[in-house]
Interface confidence: medium
Amino acid sequence: MSSKYPRSVRRCLPLWALTLEAALILLFYFFTHYDASLEDQKGLVASYQVGQDLTVMAAIGLGFLTSSFRRHSWSSVAFNLFMLALGVQWAILLDGFLSQFPSGKVVITLFSIRLATMSALSVLISVDAVLGKVNLAQLVVMVLVEVTALGNLRMVISNIFNTDYHMNMMHIYVFAAYFGLSVAWCLPKPLPEGTEDKDQTATIPSLSAMLGALFLWMFWPSFNSALLRSPIERKNAVFNTYYAVAVSVVTAISGSSLAHPQGKISKTYVHSAVLAGGVAVGTSCHLIPSPWLAMVLGLVAGLISVGGAKYLPGCCNRVLGIPHSSIMGYNFSLLGLLGEIIYIVLLVLDTVGAGNGMIGFQVLLSIGELSLAIVIALMSGLLTGLLLNLKIWKAPHEAKYFDDQVFWKFPHLAVGF
């Protein structure tokens, strides 16, 4: 007998998703319109290209990066696309409502689409910790809650701490990591006997995960520079991110070999560590004055990432039920913190150099921003985890974790799981 969604989910998912989509269409109908200003064509094309880079990162990069499970690769890629498509729509509306709504209409520009794609990327980072343990109906809830939480966090940080788009979006790494880890903590953990093989990686899915990592690696400079307004800041952000990710690749591969008793290279370490430099320089990529400094950060980030990948999975597997290959959550949590600390250090050195007596205040503001991001991530993550545990979502049974056949039709298979 072929494996199916439970009957209740077959009713629940299409109804839930299509009702939500209809509601979004109505909201777009009543509250949005396109930017009618005279756009410079050259600027328009350049702006679109950045948005396109972000979409490639989200759909292909993060989609394939999370596809390394032996029996869950289809779901990883397709569910990522589903979440991205839904997340972008909701993020555009939410950002518009939070920032423009007093005018009565939300003006959609290429910049707002870029912002929305980055907000949706947050979900794709977080979901790495729970993919395989939840169904699409639950992922819809996760998208809505996380995009809403991130949007509100950004608005609060912008208003209280007076930070620009780039700075308040660069909390995305820490926010997404802690959100994902706290959701994972709430979900049922123990894998029953006999299903351990399903959360292991296989060669072909691992190759596609490496492809995802390569796409992310290529486009990470676009991500770190996407929200910077000034062309010069953007140029420096691109350069510094490029140098950082270049060094983190070399560090990841050599560090992975160093960490193995026989000097072998771990695919899992490499998938994630190649991105380490990009995450670490994210917050301060436009402020770093020299390539050498970005390269040092890439080196440190690569080492932290490999070290984390070696020693943290055991802990994360026991406490959070996160499989060994889903290392994005704790990787980003460590590297995001590193990036924030680097920014604070630059801030301190900056204010010392200027003979400014406000060092303590500035550092306090930065720590306040970071703490707020972590607290909101943990709280909203726990709330999401509790919501996902509700019976109405008909979550997959633990015995059917990490199994594409629960969700997909495979005509060539005579029997189901």
């Epitope: 756009e39 050259k42 600027g43 702006s47 307004r229 140029k235 436009h286 402020l287 004055p289 204010t351």
Partner: antibody
Framework: QVTLKESGPVLVKPTETLTLTCTVS??????????VSWIRQPPGKALEWLAH???????SYSTSLKSRLTISKDTSKSQVFLTMTNMDPVDTATYYC??????????????????????WGKGTTVTVSS | DIQVTQSPSSLSASVGDRVTINCRAS??????LNWYQQKPGKAPNLLIY???SLQSGVPSRFSGSGSGTDFTLTISSLQPEDFATYYC??????????FGRGTKVEIK
């Protein structure tokens, strides 16, 4: 020689939309180190920054007026436009456009980006009245 | 938004006097502060950028200092053509670059 010249209607009725044009010469709107800002000054009052456009077409707006303002440019004609909707008598002011270069200073440990308005137009006076 | 407060709002001085105008930001803005001079019926003119850098063509009697929240514009020896209104402006915080309310320097 760098010059900026504002043009637009002298009189606007309340609730109407104001469109101002700034025609620049002596520098290129494509220059990565150059932007253009709009500033206004009501009679007898202080200067108020309204909006800014960078060479890469990124824009910044005054928080309080963001919902009413649109800045754009036509690089081929060396023109920058400011559109302000739902005009009110309190919007009566002299409107200036100004070249806004970005100076990058390399510190010991970080980069600094300084923005300032170094060349201003003469201004155009707009009265909002029915 | 970051607010900038200028003091005094007006002052009277004689030619040759040393004049100082203060500007205070509501939060630390590093050295992202500019000073402008505006004469009646004219457009403003940039004097100082980045708190202390003198704009080319501006007489050396004008100088700027300060960082963080407190800034000062000093005119070492006031000249007849210096009687005008002076504005400070912060460019630390995007998207809004705010101006002070101005200081009017009048003849005593």
């Amino acid at each position: 020689q760098v010059t900026l010249k504002e043009s637009g209607p002298v009189l606007v009725k309340p609730t109407e939309t104001l469109t101002l044009t700034c025609t620049v010469s002596g520098f290129s709107l494509n220059n990565a180190r150059m932007g253009v800002s709009w500033i206004r000054q009501p009679p007898g009052k202080a200067l108020e920054w309204l909006a800014h456009i960078f060479s890469n077409d990124e824009k910044s707006y005054s928080t309080s007026l963001k919902s009413r303002l649109t800045i754009s440019k036509d690089t081929s004609k060396s023109q920058v436009f400011l559109t302000m909707t739902n005009m009110d008598p309190v919007d009566t002011a002299t409107y200036y456009c100004a070249r806004t270069p970005i100076t990058m200073v390399r510190g010991a440990i970080r980069l600094y980006y300084y923005y300032y308005m170094d060349v201003w137009g003469k201004g155009t006076t707009v009265t909002v009245s029915s | 938004d970051i607010q900038v407060t200028q003091s005094p709002s007006s002052l009277s001085a004689s030619v040759g006097d040393r004049v100082t105008i203060n500007c205070r930001a509501s939060q630390s803005i590093g050295t992202y502060l500019n000073w402008y001079q505006q004469k009646p019926g004219k457009a403003p003119n940039l004097l100082i950028y980045a708190a202390s850098s003198l704009q080319s063509g501006v007489p050396s009697r004008f100088s700027g200092s300060g960082s963080g929240t407190d800034f000062t514009l000093t005119i070492s020896s006031l000249q007849p053509e210096d009687f005008a209104t002076y504005y400070c402006q912060q460019t630390y915080s995007t998207p809004t670059w705010t101006f002070g309310r101005g200081t009017k320097v009048e003849i005593k």
